[in-house]
């Protein structure tokens, strides 16, 4: 007996071939011997089965001796043994219809769990193997669980259902609601304008919610809310903003914040949260601000950085076109009685310059 696997809601074509390539009498019946469709003269006739409004045949192939039965909008209960009667012979085809659906909404927050449930006909014992867009393989039986969704799980999941050495493939689109980056750091010289951007890793037709940026300045003992905002159909409106600093926010996505001036007292780290309408939980993105200041006071040339820096970062003071350099893995470096000329303060990571500030030392007479 031939086995054919089908997908719930899909279409299947069951084939039946006569030995002679010509138009002849044929009938398709179910296991209860109820006629589904057949030929009468040159016309397709339908029987009293519950499939009749969803069953059809490729009439154009009848004169080739091919008498297919097409079943549209498959249901799990269409799983049955179908019998094609042609030229005094019977061909049996066992149809097994499976459905694979996500238990919840397919738009899930990062860290939430995804459960896929397999609907299958009674008596079947299928196995399921799913592959995430990032190449992660998960196996299961009637249910498949992904406990903690990650950003890279967004996209089309391909799930293969196997039964009797046959397979059928399902594609399920999963959208992981998250920011494109978990964390970002902005490096600025004192006095420069600071731009913070929070691009989303997904697109939704309607995007509504509310958000807030909490800031923990390095010099402050506690964090404070810098700005709160609403998001309505991808339009951003500010609800409340602190007086110091006076942040500005873009009206369109991606979420965009501007700090007029980078000052040492603002250096630190922030956490932007976004709560989406009809979703439990919040999206998070961490943002860091590192501020550099180079100053000359009497005989002392100093370069300092404030904000969250890694211990492996190097801070250097270097005289342009000269070999004179002082470097430290610290947040401040200085040179006593510096030579006259243009000095560069550099914050670097393994040779890659993250931030630089120039200061001119004039000769003292």
């Amino acid at each position: 007996k031939k086995v054919v696997l089908g997908k719930k809601g899909d279409t299947v074509e069951l084939t039946c071939n006569a030995s002679q390539k010509k138009n002849t009498q044929f009938h398709w019946k179910n296991s209860n011997q109820i006629k589904i469709l057949g030929i009468q003269g040159l016309f397709l006739t339908k029987g009293p089965s519950k499939l009749s409004d969803r069953a059809d045949s490729r009439k154009s192939l009848w004169d080739q001796g091919c008498f297919s039965m097409i079943i549209k909008n498959l249901k799990i209960e269409d799983s049955d043994t179908y019998i094609c009667e042609v030229e005094n012979k019977k061909e049996e085809v066992e149809l097994l219809v499976f459905g694979l659906t996500a238990n919840s909404d397919t738009h899930l927050l990062e860290g939430q769990s995804l459960t896929l449930t397999l609907e299958s006909p009674p008596g079947s014992s299928p196995s399921v193997k799913c592959r995430s867009p990032g190449g992660k393989n998960i196996q299961g039986g009637r249910t498949i669980s992904v406990p903690q969704l990650e950003r890279q799980d967004s996209g089309t999941w391909t799930c293969t259902v196997s039964q009797d050495q046959k397979t059928v493939e399902f594609k399920i689109d999963i959208v992981v609601l998250a920011f494109q980056k978990a964390s970002s750091t902005v490096y600025k010289k004192e006095g420069e304008q600071v731009e913070f951007s929070f691009p989303l890793a997904f697109t939704l037709e309607k995007l509504t919610g509310s958000g807030e940026l909490w800031w923990q300045a390095e010099r402050a003992s506690s964090s404070k809310s810098w700005i709160t905002f609403d998001l309505k159909n991808k339009e951003v409106s500010v609800k409340r903003v602190t007086q110091d600093p006076k942040l500005q926010m873009g009206k369109k996505l991606p979420l965009h914040l501007t700090l007029p001036q980078a000052l040492p007292q603002y250096a630190g780290s922030g956490n932007l949260t976004l709560a989406l309408e009809a979703k439990t939980g919040k999206l998070h993105q961490e943002v860091n601000l590192v501020v550099m200041r180079a100053t000359q006071f009497q005989e002392n040339l100093t370069c300092e950085v404030w904000g969250p820096t890694s211990p492996k970062l190097t801070l250097s003071l270097k005289l342009e076109n000269k070999g004179a350099t002082v470097s430290k893995q610290a947040k401040a470096v200085w040179v006593l009685n510096p030579e006259a000329g243009m000095w560069q303060c550099l914050l670097s990571d393994s040779g890659q310059v993250l931030l630089e500030s120039n200061i001119k030392v004039v000769p003292t007479w």
């Epitope: 279409t11 299947v12 490729r58 009439k59 154009s60 192939l61 004169d63 091919c66 097409i70 549209k72």
Partner: antibody, heavy 121, light 108 residues
Framework: QVQLQESGPGLVKPSQTLSLTCTVS??????????WSWIRQHPGKGLEWIGY???????YYNPSLKSRLTISVNTSKNQFSLKLSSLTAADTAVYYC?????????????WGQGTMVTVSS | EIVLTQSPGTLSLSPGERATLSCRAS???????LAWYQQKPGQAPRLLIY???SRATGIPDRFSGSGSGTDFTLTISRLEPEDFAVYYC?????????FGPGTKVDIK
């Protein structure tokens, strides 16, 4: 989404054999109950169905072209091909590849953009 | 083979008007074995209707199909500027699959 792209020579000499290939992108040629067709359109005229190959590899040809026609599939390259022999000027046409699926069987829901074939010495 | 005849050969109408295109088969193609296509110059045909009256994916509801047996109709309720094209009917009730000669809908 699924796209079809025809390729082959634009000019063929009479009595020679025409070879055209249709490359399917966006889906596997063997993934569904699809039938893959060749259809042609003579300059300024209507459409003529040439034949098709099914998901199972069965071929069905227009009787008027059957003796000169071969349609085959290469699943590893996601392509299907047409070979039409003993060409005459009457075979000059735009050749399209197309797909039908069982939910709208024998009606062609996706077409290639077509390739013009001229039979001339 | 089943021969399809389309009428009229050319239909001259203005945008906003109703267009009624006819397709007649030389013998019955069954109740639903007929499709309609639209073709614009230099482009491949586009499936509009299959199964005599089912709209293909993405086709606006101003296009509708009706008929069975040997007589079928494509109706465009209100012509839009982009609807001016050639329309073909195709039968799949019998092998070989055949197309009609087409009806050209042009701007009056």
């Amino acid at each position: 989404q699924v796209q079809l792209q025809e390729s082959g020579p634009g000019l063929v000499k009479p009595s020679q054999t025409l070879s055209l290939t249709c490359t399917v992108s966006g889906d596997s040629i063997s993934s569904g109950y699809y039938y893959w067709s060749w259809i042609r359109q003579h300059p300024g005229k209507g459409l003529e169905w040439i034949g098709y190959i099914s998901y199972s590899g069965s071929t069905y040809y227009n009787p008027s072209l059957k003796s000169r026609l071969t349609i085959s599939v290469n699943t590893s390259k996601n392509q299907f091909s047409l070979k039409l022999s003993s060409l005459t000027a009457a075979d000059t046409a735009v050749y399209y590849c197309a797909r039908d699926r069982p939910s709208n069987f024998d009606a062609f829901d996706i077409w290639g953009q077509g390739t013009m074939v001229t039979v001339s010495s | 083979e089943i021969v399809l005849t389309q009428s009229p050969g050319t239909l001259s109408l203005s945008p906003g008007e109703r267009a009624t295109l006819s397709c007649r088969a030389s013998q019955s193609v069954g109740s639903t074995y007929l499709a309609w296509y639209q073709q614009k110059p230099g482009q491949a045909p586009r499936l509009l209707i299959y199964g005599a009256f089912s709209r293909a994916t993405g086709i606006p509801d101003r296009f509708s199909g009706s008929g069975s047996g040997t007589d079928f109709t494509l109706t465009i309720s209100r012509l839009e500027p982009e609807d001016f094209a050639v329309y073909y009917c195709q039968q799949y009730g019998s092998s070989p699959l055949t197309f009609g000669p087409g009806t050209k809908v042009d701007i009056k």
